[in-house]
Amino acid sequence: AWELTILHTNDVHSRLEQTSEDSSKCVNASRCMGGVARLFTKVQQIRRAEPNVLLLDAGDQYQGTIWFTVYKGAEVAHFMNALRYDAMALGNHEFDNGVEGLIEPLLKEAKFPILSANIKAKGPLASQISGLYLPYKVLPVGDEVVGIVGYTSKETPFLSNPGTNLVFEDEITALQPEVDKLKTLNVNKIIALGHSGFEMDKLIAQKVRGVDVVVGGHSNTFLYTGNPPSKEVPAGKYPFIVTSDDGRKVPVVQAYAFGKYLGYLKIEFDERGNVISSHGNPILLNSSIPEDPSIKADINKWRIKLDNYSTQELGKTIVYLDGSSQSCRFRECNMGNLICDAMINNNLRHTDEMFWNHVSMCILNGGGIRSPIDERNNGTITWENLAAVLPFGGTFDLVQLKGSTLKKAFEHSVHRYGQSTGEFLQVGGIHVVYDLSRKPGDRVVKLDVLCTKCRVPSYDPLKMDEVYKVILPNFLANGGDGFQMIKDELLRHDSGDQDINVVSTYISKMKVIYPAVEGRIKFSTGSH
């Protein structure tokens, strides 16, 4: 028998520095977690103690903090090189700055293979990107060889900016021939490493003949056997065992997100490459693990540029950006409109001639808007200003919801109106009329939504049975501010870009902004 240790991360999302327990900015260092310096300490400890170790990343290193905004992926290559990752799969967020924003900072600089078997380049890009990412890589590990095949969510064109010269194929269809090829070349231990979410990970384990282990990402899935060490609630045991169609037991793992945990899986193979046993657990990277001093020093060196960036002007406003709780928790506020407009703008993807865009709607809890911005400071808007408006380090995500769920959400928005509570929704691509004289749960008297399958966008009444795409904060997607119906009834959830980054990019693009209050949210009384 031969034992392999798989160390794995996924959805790190730019958390190079240690964070608080909820993966936001570290405040009290003695209670902070994660970060590449602490990760390196643990990885090195395991490498020294065990003979056959692979360190793998299942994608979405890009996007999430000011580190990515400033360094644009160079930080990912640099610190992953320093940690000596063995392989990485491409995630959807690796395309956030377009293909060039992937090629130059990461693909050309990484000293480890970057993988995806289901992304095929065409046209002029094919020769430019040739060899920069691979469908698989065969790695020598101890006295054996291990094949690693990569995959990426086929929804990436709707979630990011891969352009028109990359085709995202069905994961299972693309993986099978690559695995078959490795088998014919006597590679009998194969790991599928990828970024399509836990449901697809399980399908790959079930359907792709010859895959021995699946290491996934995208869905931020936390798996754990025994008593979990922090706040995350396990979605199942670690590893999660799938019985494949050909009768094998295939371990599937994921390690939550944000570098809070290091996935740790031990696999025992027989001489024919069959998995005999698998066990392990994610390791919580808490403050009991010291940060490696050399990596920490490097982080501090790279940090300097971030501090300078946060005070630079992104653009100007010529109007007061009303982000006060007195406005945003009671009525339409122009800060809410600005943020929602930025959220939609960030999700412009012309992937189908029938649709002007795949999504037109935004909702945003008023309680998430934490500060106004005064235009009388020469109109200057900085990252620092935006960090005061959106201080929680969240993301603006894409969900699919039925109209009936949206209607419930808008009822919830005003179910206790007048108490300055955070659930009052700011909107984009939606016209809502409330009648507060009616009883809670029956106050939405008009709800019109902007069409997507149209050449001239216009507002049509919400249909209860129709499925709609909506951009919203991850806080709402996770049921925050009492929006349990969103969490319980959403049909799909894909994590998006860092909230401040979305708004800062929009302001930089527009240069001068002047958002108005324009009748997106109205109140009526009596019959409507």
Epitope: R47, N52, G131, V141, G142, D143, N186
Partner: antibody, heavy 118, light 107 residues
Amino acid sequence: EVQLVESGAEVKKPGASVKVSCKASGYTFTDSNMDWVRQAPGQGLEWMGDINPNNGGTIYNQKFKGRVTMTRDTSINTAYMELSRLRSDDTAVYYCAMTNWDYAMDYWGQGTTVTVSS
Amino acid sequence: DIVMTQSPSSLSASVGDRVTITCKASQDINSQLSWYQQKPGKAPKLLIYRANRLIDGVPSRFSGSGSGTDFTLTISSLQPEDFATYYCQQYDVFPRTFGQGTKVEIK
């Protein structure tokens, strides 16, 4: 600057063994795999195998399996290749080569000539 | 094992000429191909890896291209120091295998 310095030329009789050393400097020895390649007189290059100096793991070309042993001594940053049951057609220059992150052979030793003759 | 076939096995060219050497793999090698230059009595020297990535310090007149099974090494303007034997090598799978070499001689 990366340097790989191999041991001197050897003359061996058929059936004997030879052990060639390769001393590395200018980089962290345990960070890169070491490959061994040979070249018979007037011929092309032939890959023999690979050792991971970090854990001593080896991958051998089946053609040499049972005859070749690759080892390392991390205390002196040196890799070794031993070939046993020598035959006349093992006469060749034997090279060690450090592989880069992608496993291409980045830096090569100067070569050790091994002559097998009765 | 994957068989690497180089062509031509030798060629004569003049300084300033554009020279192209091809290498064909017996099956798709996933761009895991390197090119080496070897001068008489010397060890090989890595020029290109991952089919098209030039090693630091190697002159830009050398370039690599290709994917799948067919690969090319091009010297855009041959210089006197380029007369040598060139080898391709696949490192996609084990065992690593080399082409038989292409000797570039002075015309």
